[in-house]
C-alpha cells in the first residue's frame, strides 16, 4: 500500500527569488512554496522564477553565469558550484512539525536561516540555497 | 537540538568548500545574537553534480 | 514507488501487549518521521504517536503515554509500535503514515489488532 | 486539543454531482490540514496537503480551500472511484487530530 507522492522538486531560496524544476501550489500565509515532497526529488536548477503572489510564478530560463578558469567544486554546465552543509541548532527542539513546510515553526526556521545565509555570504556569487531538511540532533 | 542539512549554490570560482566553512564558522556569534541561533558541529562538502535530494543526506544520522 | 508495508493481523488476550511493524521501501532516505494512528471498528482515525527514523525522538499522544513504545530500525527501514496492556477497546486497526517532505505522505494497509480472551 | 468538526457525517450524491464537504477548527491552524481518502477496503490515501496543494496521481477535480477556519474540500464532478469516506486532519499542533469523517455515498 503506497501513498500518493508529490512530484515538486527543491525552492532555491534567495532575496526573494528562486530557482526550481517543478512549480508546485503555494498557499497565500506562506513566504515559501510548499512542495510536497521537496525531499524526493532531483533538484535542478530549470528555470528562474520571481514569486509575485502565492499563487503565480513567472518564469525564464537561467541566463548563463559567469564562470572562471578554475573550478571549486563539481559545477553545472551553467557555471555553478554546489555545497552541502551540515550544522547543529543547540538551543532549539527539534519536533514532528519541522518535517512540515507549511507549519509556523518549519517556516520561521527556514527564515531565519535563509536570511542568516544571505548575511553570511552577501560578498557576492551566493545563488541561494536549497533541499533545506531538518532532523533531531 | 536540530539538525540542518541544505545545499547551497554560489557561481562557480567565487568560493571553495574552505571558504565557505570559514565565512559561516565566523558567522556562528552574530547568528546567536541576531537570530537567537546557537550552531555548532558544522560540516561542509562538494556535491557532486548531477545530483539528487536524496543523494547528499546519506553521511548524517 | 514508495511503499509501506505493515505487519499481519494479530488476536493477543486482554493484558497482554502487541508489536507490530511497519516497514517502508522505495525511497533513498533513511531518516524521516513515522506517525501511529488507529481506527477502532466503525469509528474516525486516532493520532498515537510519532518516531523519527533512526533516532530516539518520539511524541506521544497523552492519551496512550506509558502503554505506547515507539521505535525503529533504520537498517531495515523499519518502524515498530508496542501497545502494552491491552484492553478490548484496543482492539482497532492501526495504521503507520511517514513523511515524505510533508506529514503523513504515505500510507501503509493497516494492522488489525483484535483483543479478545 | 485542537477539535475538527466535519460536516457533513454522511452524504449521497451521484455520479456528475459536486460534492462539498467541510472541516471547522476550533483553533487557528493557520494550512496545516490535510484531506485524507479511506476505500471502503480500508486503505488510505493523502489527496490535499496544506489545506489546498494536490498530491501528484491525485485527479483535478478534487481540490481544498479555506475560509477562515473553514476548510473545504470540494469534488466538482463525483467518479465510480470516489465513494468513500473523507477526513480531514490537522496538524498545527500536538496531538495531531482527525475530524470525525464523512461517508460519501451512492444516491
Known amino acids: 500500500a503506497s501513498g500518493s507522492a508529490s512530484g515538486s522538486a527543491s525552492t532555491l531560496v534567495h532575496n526573494g527569488t528562486s530557482a526550481r524544476a517543478t512549480t508546485t501550489p503555494a498557499s497565500k500565509s506562506t513566504p515559501f512554496s510548499i512542495p510536497s515532497h521537496h525531499s524526493d526529488t532531483p533538484t535542478t536548477l530549470a528555470s528562474h522564477s520571481t514569486k509575485t503572489d502565492a499563487s503565480s510564478t513567472h518564469h525564464s530560463s537561467v541566463p548563463p553565469l559567469t564562470s572562471s578558469n578554475h573550478s571549486t567544486s563539481p559545477q553545472l554546465s551553467t557555471g555553478v558550484s554546489f555545497f552541502f552543509l551540515s550544522f547543529h541548532i543547540s538551543n532549539l527542539q527539534f519536533n514532528s512539525s519541522l518535517e512540515d513546510p507549511s507549519t509556523d515553526y518549519y517556516q520561521e526556521l527556514q527564515r531565519d536561516i535563509s536570511e542568516m545565509f544571505l548575511q553570511i555570504y552577501k560578498q557576492g556569487g551566493f545563488l541561494g540555497l536549497s533541499n533545506i531538511k531538518f532532523r533531531p540532533g | 537540538s536540530v539538525v540542518v542539512q541544505l545545499t547551497l549554490a554560489f557561481r562557480e570560482g567565487t568560493i571553495n568548500v574552505h571558504d565557505v566553512e570559514t565565512q559561516f564558522n565566523q558567522y556562528k556569534t552574530e547568528a546567536a545574537s541576531r537570530y537567537n541561533l546557537t550552531i555548532s558541529d558544522v560540516s561542509v562538502s562538494d556535491v557532486p553534480f548531477p545530483f539528487s535530494a536524496q543523494s547528499h543526506h546519506h553521511h548524517h544520522h | 514507488e514508495v511503499q509501506l508495508v505493515q505487519s499481519g493481523a494479530e488476536v493477543v488476550k486482554p493484558g497482554a501487549s502487541v508489536k507490530m511493524s511497519c516497514k517502508t521501501s522505495?525511497?533513498?532516505?533513511?531518516?524521516?518521521?513515522i506517525n501511529w494512528v488507529r481506527q477502532r471498528p466503525g469509528q474516525g482515525l486516532e493520532w498515537i504517536g510519532y518516531i523519527y527514523l533512526g533516532s530516539d525522538y518520539t511524541e506521544y499522544n497523552e492519551k496512550f503515554k506509558g502503554r505506547v513504545t515507539l521505535t525503529s530500525d533504520t537498517s531495515a527501514s523499519t518502524a515498530y509500535m508496542e501497545l502494552s496492556s491491552l484492553r478490548s477497546e484496543d482492539t482497532a486497526v492501526y495504521y503507520c503514515?511517514?513523511?515524505?517532505?510533508?506529514?503523513?505522505?504515505?500510507w501503509g494497509q493497516g494492522t488489525l489488532v483484535t483483543v479478545s480472551s | 486539543d485542537i477539535q475538527l468538526t466535519q460536516s457533513p457525517s454522511s452524504l449521497s450524491a451521484s455520479v456528475g454531482d459536486r460534492v462539498t464537504i467541510t472541516c471547522r477548527a476550533s483553533q487557528d491552524i493557520g494550512i496545516t490540514l490535510n484531506w485524507l481518502q479511506q476505500e471502503p477496503g480500508g486503505a488510505i490515501k493523502r489527496l490535499i496537503y496544506a489545506t489546498s496543494s494536490l498530491d501528484s496521481g491525485v485527479p483535478k477535480r478534487f481540490s481544498g480551500s479555506r475560509s477562515g477556519s473553514d476548510y473545504t474540500l470540494t469534488i466538482s464532478s463525483l467518479q465510480p472511484e470516489d465513494f468513500a469516506t473523507y477526513y480531514c486532519?490537522?496538524?498545527?499542533?500536538?496531538?495531531?487530530?482527525f475530524g470525525g469523517g464523512t461517508k460519501v455515498e451512492i444516491k
Open positions: 486532519l490537522q496538524y498545527a499542533s500536538s496531538p495531531y487530530t
Open positions: 503514515a511517514r513523511s515524505g517532505g510533508s506529514l503523513f505522505a504515505y
Open positions: 522505495g525511497y533513498t532516505f533513511t531518516s524521516y518521521g
